[in-house]
């Protein structure tokens, strides 16, 4: 093949090499950018910055090498458009630092930074951690900080991410109230902070106020939907990012629903209860307190993380006719109480049928809110005896 006279020349099926001295000062408009998987750049002393716009359109890029060039600054978001990047070689440039944000979200198998005049400060604590944890081939490079010493020796006791404290109201919050949250941010080199409110949706009207180091958030006209929803305060410094989530408890009265009994492994009378604080529960059977046993007991399903409603069953282990009747669930919290009742018939009384009648062999349960309802009988051509143990 004829030698390529251009600043950048194709290399393999999806690679590009740019090695002609001083030919580039940015990476805009590289030929065939959208299909490139490998980009090799060398001896480009005028290439001093790498920014977001430089790598736009290089979505397939996997290997990026910029060596022996003049790179002084790599923007924190420089690789936003190259999420598949797995090998990054920036050796022998003029980099003094590299933000943790630059590599965040990438799955780098290799990161080469040797031969740069790195300056040890808390901004390189993440890189020191990579070295400690053996990530990205960093330990083998034995990185030196210019004028100081090995990166491994950099003291890091003061290199912490921000500390966050979120103040929530201690007093009870009722539906319709306005709630003020305050996020206090402490730490060195604070850069950015804010709130993440994605879970809130229609739970309240949101108003943000203040800025570092004290962020305010007003949740106006709150609804009961706000319960169990995360309100997250975040902050970043040159070391990394910290997040703290809190939940606001909005008080509302107990409510309860009962559903038709269903036969599973045991029988189940399904229920749903809601309320904040979580209501206490009591079962009645035919108007009297039902004492739970290992044969009849309340069982809750795993609660959903982001809602107050609890679903469960009154479990009945092989119920008989003596368990037929009216079941009532009482739910109460300091803001109100509620009840719901349901009739359940698990089995007909075996001693209440006429010997002249056909023998009922199996029953479909009849659950209604009234006491009426006839068992469904199943006639069989072959008569046989049925013995029922009543316990």
């Amino acid at each position: 093949a004829a030698p390529c006279p251009d600043a950048c020349c194709p290399h393999g099926s999806s690679g590009l090499r740019c090695t002609r001295d001083g030919a580039l000062d940015s990476l805009h408009h590289l030929p065939g950018a959208e299909n490139l998987t490998e980009l090799y750049i060398e001896n480009q002393q005028h290439l001093q910055h790498l920014e977001l716009r430089d790598l736009r359109g290089l979505g397939e890029l996997r290997n990026l090498t910029i060596v022996k060039s003049g790179l002084r600054f790599v923007a924190p978001d420089a690789f936003h458009f190259t999420p598949r990047l797995s090998r990054l070689n920036l050796s022998f440039n003029a980099l003094e630092s590299l933000s943790w944000k630059t590599v965040q979200g990438l799955s780098l198998q290799e990161l080469v930074l040797s031969g740069n005049p790195l300056h040890c400060s808390c901004a390189l604590r993440w890189l020191q951690r990579w070295e400690e944890e053996g990530l990205g081939g960093v330990p083998e490079q034995k990185l030196q900080c210019h004028g100081q010493g090995p990166l491994a020796h950099m003291p890091n006791a003061s290199c912490g991410v921000p500390t966050l404290k979120v103040q929530v109201p201690n007093a009870s919050v009722d539906v319709g109230d306005d709630v003020l949250l305050r996020c206090q941010v402490e730490g060195r080199g604070l850069e950015q902070a804010g709130w993440i409110l994605t879970e809130l949706e229609q739970s309240a009207t949101v108003m943000k106020s203040g800025g570092l180091p004290s962020l305010g958030l007003t949740l106006a006209n709150v609804t009961s939907d706000l319960n169990r929803k995360n309100v997250t305060c975040w902050a970043e410094n040159d070391v990394g990012r910290a997040e703290v989530s809190v939940q606001v408890n909005v008080s509302f009265p107990a409510s309860v629903q009962l559903h038709t009994a269903v036969e599973m492994h045991h029988w189940c009378i399904p229920f749903s209860v809601d309320g904040q604080p979580a209501p206490s529960l009591r079962w009645l059977f035919n108007g009297s307190v039902l004492n739970e046993t290992s044969f009849i007991f309340t069982e809750f399903l795993e609660p959903a993380a982001n809602e107050t409603v609890r679903h469960g069953c009154l479990r009945l282990n092989q119920p008989t006719h003596v368990n037929n009747g009216n079941y009532t669930l009482l739910a109460a919290n300091p803001f109100g109480q509620a009840s719901a009742s349901i009739m359940a018939a698990f089995m007909d009384n075996p001693f209440e049928f006429n010997p002249e009648d056909p023998i009922p062999v199996s029953f479909s349960p009849v659950d209604t809110n009234s006491t009426s309802g006839d068992p469904v009988e199943k006639k069989d051509e072959t008569p046989f005896g049925v013995s029922v143990a009543v316990g």
Epitope: E96, P117, H119, S121, C122, Q144, H146, G147, Q148, G149, P150, H153, M154, P155, A157, S158, C159, R188, G189
Partner: antibody, heavy 119, light 106 residues
């Protein structure tokens, strides 16, 4: 014990150059960065630059770019600082100091070399 | 470059006095260093990484602070402590020094 011994006082004319030496002993010379700091009469301390004797990697403060050359001779464990195009405001005491990375500070200093620039 | 501002620039005190010198950085630094210098001598390290005493330094010297504000305290001034004190940062390149605080006998 660790010691840095500097060359003697110099008197130079404006426009001339001066080369100050700093001989290290008591430690592995090639392992620690050597820095140069100066102090004009009655003034504070001003950083000039640094060299890594292990590979001659060096850098200087912007103010001295193009006028300062830092070198070393590993065979004699000596670091050198050469300042060219001298002007009267370069009159100062010049110090070499080691950056001790185990505790992360300038732990040992040379005794200083007085450079006087006068016509 | 990070600017280091020391205050006061000079102070007069008596033997036995408690002396406090402050150093403010123009932006946040991880650590601060303090040096003592006597006339005609090289600077001598006193405190490294904000609060650690350098070898051979008496315990009456102490350092504290974080972010941009740091303090050197001499709990009970001794005759040999009359000197000029410098703070220095090396959090950000290049290393920079404060203008110095001269402690004189009252």
């Amino acid at each position: 014990q660790v010691q840095l011994v500097q060359s003697g006082a110099e008197v130079k004319k404006p426009g001339a150059s001066v080369k100050v030496s700093c001989k290290a002993s008591g430690y592995t010379f090639t392992t620690y960065w050597m820095h140069w700091v100066r102090q004009a009469p009655g003034q504070g301390l001003e950083w000039i630059g640094t060299i890594y004797p292990g590979n001659s990697d060096s850098s200087n403060a912007q103010k001295f770019q193009g006028r300062v050359t830092l070198t070393r001779d590993t065979s004699t464990s000596t670091a050198y600082m050469e300042l060219s195009s001298l002007r009267s405001e370069d009159t100062a005491v010049y110090y070499c100091t080691r950056f001790y990375y185990e505790d992360w500070y300038f732990d040992v200093w040379g005794q200083g070399t007085t450079v006087t620039v006068s016509s | 470059d990070i600017q280091m501002t020391q205050s006061p620039s000079s102070l007069s005190a008596s033997v036995g006095d408690r002396v406090t010198i402050t150093c403010r950085a123009s932006s946040s630094v991880s650590y601060l260093y303090w040096f003592q210098q006597k006339p005609g001598k090289a600077p001598k390290p006193l405190i490294y990484r904000t609060s650690n005493l350098a070898s051979g330094v008496p315990s009456r010297f102490s350092g504290s602070g974080s972010g941009t504000d740091y303090t050197l305290t001499i709990s009970s001034l001794q005759p040999e402590d009359f000197a000029t004190y410098y703070c220095q940062q090396y959090h950000s390149y290049p290393p920079t020094f404060g203008g110095g605080t001269k402690v004189e006998i009252k």
